[in-house]
Interface confidence: medium
C-alpha cells in the first residue's frame, strides 16, 4: 500500500534569463528511494540514482544543475521553459510517486515566486 505523499514547490514563476529551483519532498512513507527522475513533459532532464549519483541529460547540461538535495536548478531560463515539470520518485517497496510543478517564465522583470517549503 502506497502511503507516501509528495510536496512540491507548486506553481512558480521566474524571470527570463534567471534561475529557479525545482523541489519535491516525499513524506509519510518509510520506502527506500532508489531513483528520482526529473522530466519536462516527456523529456528527461536529469536522474538522481541512489547508487550512481546525479546525471544530467545532454540536451540540458549547460543549463541544469543538480540539487539542492534531490531538487533541480534551472539556469538561463527562456520563455520556452514554461510548462509542467515532474519529479518521479522510484521507491521500494511502494513503487512510483509523481509530483508536478508548473513553471511560468516571464518576460517582465517582475516575477512572483511560488511558496517554498
Amino acid at each position: 500500500m502506497m502511503t507516501g505523499t509528495i510536496e512540491t514547490t507548486g506553481n512558480i514563476s521566474a524571470e527570463k534569463g534567471g534561475s529557479i529551483i525545482l523541489q519535491c519532498h516525499l513524506s509519510s512513507t518509510t520506502a527506500q528511494v532508489t531513483q528520482v527522475n526529473w522530466e519536462q513533459q516527456d523529456q528527461l532532464l536529469a536522474i538522481c540514482n541512489a547508487d550512481l549519483g546525479w546525471h544530467i541529460s545532454p540536451s540540458f547540461k549547460d543549463r541544469v544543475a543538480p540539487g539542492p538535495g534531490l531538487g533541480l536548478t534551472l539556469q538561463s531560463l527562456t520563455v520556452n521553459d514554461t510548462g509542467e515539470y515532474f519529479c518521479i520518485y522510484h521507491t521500494y517497496p511502494d513503487g512510483t510517486y509523481t509530483g508536478r510543478i508548473f513553471l511560468e517564465v516571464l518576460e517582465s522583470s517582475v516575477a512572483e515566486h511560488g511558496a517554498r517549503f
Epitope: L44, N49, D51, L52, H55, S57, S59, K61
Partner: antibody, heavy 118, light 108 residues
Framework: EVQLVQSGAEVKKPGESLKISCKGS????????IGWVRQMPGKGLEWMGI????????RYSPSFQGQVTISADKSISTAYLQWSSLKASDTAMYYC???????????WGQGTLVTVSS | SYELTQPPSVSVAPGQTARITCSGD??????ASWYQQKPGQAPVLVIY???KRPSGIPERFSGSNSGNTATLTISGTQAEDEADYYC??????????FGGGTKLTVLG
Amino acid sequence: EVQLVQSGAEVKKPGESLKISCKGSGYSFTSYWIGWVRQMPGKGLEWMGIIYPGDSDTRYSPSFQGQVTISADKSISTAYLQWSSLKASDTAMYYCARAAWWQGFDHWGQGTLVTVSS
Amino acid sequence: SYELTQPPSVSVAPGQTARITCSGDALGDKYASWYQQKPGQAPVLVIYEDSKRPSGIPERFSGSNSGNTATLTISGTQAEDEADYYCSAKDASFNSVFGGGTKLTVLG
C-alpha cells in the same frame, strides 16, 4: 574489483548461428548498461548497441538493427550478443563494456574474436 | 545517421601538448567521451562527460566540448601515450557513435 569476462574466440562458417557472452562481476549488474562494440581487423570502433539488464531496455545502432540481438540474464549477471546467420563480414573483435547513464564505457571486457570463414 | 570526424593522425614531440579534435553537428549539445587503445588491448576510457577524468587517468589528459567540436588535450605528452584515440558521443536516448580514430605518434 569490476570485471567483465567474455567468452572465448570462435571460428564459424557463413550461415551458422552464434551467441557470445559477457559476465559482469564486482558491481551491481542491474544498475549499469552493457554495450557491445565491434572492431574489424585494422579498423576503428563501432557502437553496436546497449542493454540495461535491470529491465532489458535495449537500443541498437541503425547499422546493426536487425543484424544482431542483444540480451541479458540478470540472474547470472551475463549479457549476450547473438547472430542467427553469420557472414564473412562479421569477422571482427567484439568487446562488451559497462556504462552508467551518459558516462562513457568505464570498464571493458577482454574481447571475443569471431572468425567467419568457409 | 550521426557522424563524428577525427583527423587520421597527429604527431607530437615528447613533453609537448597534443590536441586531438572530434567534430560533429551540434556535438556540444551531447556528452563526449574519449578512449585510448593500444595495439592488442581493449580500449580505456580517458575522458567522459566532456571533461571528467576517471580515477587512475593522469592529470595530463583533459577534454572540452562546445559548438561542433570536442577536443582531447594531452599536456606534457609521454612516449606511453602513443596509441589510437577515439571520441564518442551519446544522446539522451543513449544512442551512441564513435569517431574514426586518431593515431597519436610521439616523435623521437
